[in-house]
């Protein structure tokens, strides 16, 4: 049997026998275009493609539509994988989304959605989510039904205020909604009473900016 040489996601890499977490090269569906991603092969059975990570504020997340489309940052640290790749990937098969959160008091929580996909760019990478479970709130901190993605130069939210400009970062803003994991990073002791921080309302409430976040996806049938 010929060995697989291209992989569409980290689950395929894991199943090929490569089970160490790290940076791997993925290939766009139905294309030869490649992208580098961090694969988490340890959490919950492994095979997770990390699509977002925040940990120290080293990367500026107040980026343009094009940058959020194509991705930015470093897969070894803070980064955004890219809306176009995630849209194409999640449009082909059913994926689950796991969001891991850390606060500044040493607590961790997660939200797991049993079906996640992004619409195409023509629909502003609108997010679709169903089936929430987990410890980071019984109500979804990503507004339901899903919103279009907005950035500082592409305002697609439901607010007259331009949420991305006001709150910082590209996100699926409603008007503006209960979350923004791409907000301004605030260090410890400066992370409360912040209107534009890294927000997940149904875990930490208003004005609390989180220490670390990871968004990762995996095929539902993994």
């Amino acid at each position: 049997k010929e060995e697989q040489t291209t992989f569409r996601d980290c689950a395929e890499i894991f199943k090929s026998g490569l089970t160490t977490s790290g940076i791997y090269t993925l290939t766009f569906p139905n294309s030869t275009e490649e992208i580098k991603a961090y694969c988490d092969m340890d959490v919950g059975g492994g095979g997770w493609t990390v699509i977002q990570h925040r940990e120290d504020g080293s990367v500026d997340f107040q980026r343009t539509w094009k940058e959020y489309k194509e991705g930015f940052g470093s897969p070894l640290g803070e980064y955004w994988l890219g809306n176009e790749f995630v849209s194409q990937l999640t449009g082909q098969h059913r994926y689950v989304l796991k969001i891991q959160l850390k606060d500044w008091e040493g607590n961790e929580a997660h939200s797991l959605y049993d079906h996640f996909y992004l619409a195409g760019e023509e629909s502003n990478y609108r997010i679709h989510l169903t089936g929430l479970t987990g410890t980071a709130g019984k109500i979804s901190s990503i507004s339901q039904p899903g919103s279009d993605f907005s950035t500082k130069d592409s305002d697609n939210d439901k607010c007259i205020c331009k949420c991305s400009q006001m709150l910082s970062g590209g996100w699926w803003f409603d008007a503006c909604g209960p979350s923004n994991l791409n907000g301004q990073y605030y260090p410890q002791k400066q992370n409360t009473n912040k209107f534009n921080g890294i927000k997940w309302y149904y875990w930490k409430g208003s004005g609390y900016s989180l220490k670390a976040t990871t968004m990762m996806i995996r095929p539902a049938d993994f």
């Epitope: 007259i160 709150l167 004005g207």
Partner: nanobody, 130 residues
Framework: EVQLVESGGGLVQAGGSLRLSCAVS????????IGWFRQAPGKEREGVSC????????YYADSVKGRFTISSDNAKNTVYLQMNSLKPEDTAAYYC???????????????????????WGQGTQVTVSS
Amino acid sequence: EVQLVESGGGLVQAGGSLRLSCAVSGLPFDDYVIGWFRQAPGKEREGVSCISSSDGSTYYADSVKGRFTISSDNAKNTVYLQMNSLKPEDTAAYYCAAGGPRINIATMTCSHDEYEYDYWGQGTQVTVSS
């Protein structure tokens, strides 16, 4: 430092009136929304009313429409909630909260959702006796 200080609560008989005040300072916004919320013992906090500093647009919960009036004095950085025809079911701790100018495009009103407010006061108690 952002501060929201409520005052004006107290004990009043059913059918009476109270005026709550919310003094606001240090907000990091040019335009903003101030909301009034209330929480009765053993119940969820609920949005009562809100007002936008930029255009004065307002929202009222159905339970207080026609009885409560929200207003603002921008010169004093104070928002008021005039509460008339009070009922025993209005008994609660009343909180004012502040957030950015999150005005919904569809409704053109401010939000009654807690998560749209970033800063909160300590609350003032309103008790309506029958």
